[in-house]
């Protein structure tokens, strides 16, 4: 397929990466799929420079992020390695509780209105953050 | 087929108070948490509230904590929010919504609250 090589209207371009940020809440996995119809992911933070864009463009609001223990470890949406990667969790968290009495754990995690990150009941909707990354391979074939 | 029915909506002022209800069928209420979501006009959904199946467990967004209460009344099937101190940023249609495994699946029609002197 034919490389990305600009972000598309209405998303914003940082550091080879595209981000679309929501202005609506969806349950995680609606925002997973969202993401994914879009040829995106919801966001994987690989670093604190990024930690910090994508806080200065959600402000103060509980936001989902593409990291998620639904089936057992936490993993990234993307495949990039959770316990060698960036983590910014809030202090004691995650806790996976159960205790809220909603049903299940805490399995979907999001950033708080500090920015670090909690780990949340998944049905919630908070608004989302999708990011794709230039230079890969597009789904659209090549113009011939 | 599930249904969920809102009302109690309407013309409040500021500072005033409003009681939302939400009538469901079609599904074994007392078995789920049901939840409360708004959409202000020209915004985006917005979780409000939601409650355990039994009622004991309530959880509520900063935005209405302290001034906002759900609960809910099994033996009716119905949900509530009993909404105080009103602010004109509450303005919004309230929809209530049954927690399904991995989202919300089934929401109602909506009520809408407007906050104006």
């Known amino acids: 397929g034919s490389e990305r090589t600009c972000c598309p209207v209405n998303w914003v371009e940082h550091e080879r990466s595209c981000y679309w940020f929501s202005r609506s809440g969806k349950a995680w996995a609606d925002a997973d799929n969202y993401c994914r119809l879009e040829d995106a992911h919801l966001v994987v933070v690989t670093s604190w420079e990024e930690q910090k864009f994508v806080q200065h463009h959600i402000g103060p609001v509980n936001t989902w992020m593409g990291l998620h223990d639904q089936n057992g470890p936490w993993k990234w949406v993307d495949g990039t390695d959770y316990e060698t990667g960036f983590k910014n969790w809030r202090p004691e968290q995650p806790d996976d509780w159960y205790g809220h009495g909603l049903g299940g754990g805490e399995d979907c995690a999001h950033f708080t209105d500090d920015g670090r990150w909690n780990d949340d009941v998944c049905q919630r909707p908070y608004r989302w953050v999708c990011e794709t990354e230039l230079d890969k391979a597009s789904q659209e074939p090549p113009l011939l | 087929e599930v249904q969920l029915l809102e009302s109690g909506g309407g013309l409040v002022q500021p500072g005033g108070s409003l009681r939302l209800s939400c009538a469901a069928s079609?599904?074994?209420?007392?078995?789920?948490?049901m939840m409360w979501v708004r959409q202000a006009p020209g915004k985006g959904l917005e979780w409000v509230s939601d409650?355990?199946?039994?009622?004991?467990?309530?959880y509520y967004a900063d935005s209405v904590k302290g001034r906002f209460t759900i609960s809910r009344d099994n033996s009716k099937n119905t949900l509530y929010l009993q909404m105080n101190s009103l602010r004109a940023e509450d303005t919004a249609v309230y929809y209530c919504?049954?927690?399904?495994?991995?989202?919300?699946?089934?929401w109602g029609q909506g009520t809408l609250v407007t906050v104006s002197s």
């Open positions: 409650i355990s199946p039994g009622g004991r467990h309530t």
């Open positions: 079609g599904f074994t209420f007392a078995a789920y948490s």
């Open positions: 919504a049954k927690m399904g495994s991995t989202t919300f699946d089934y």
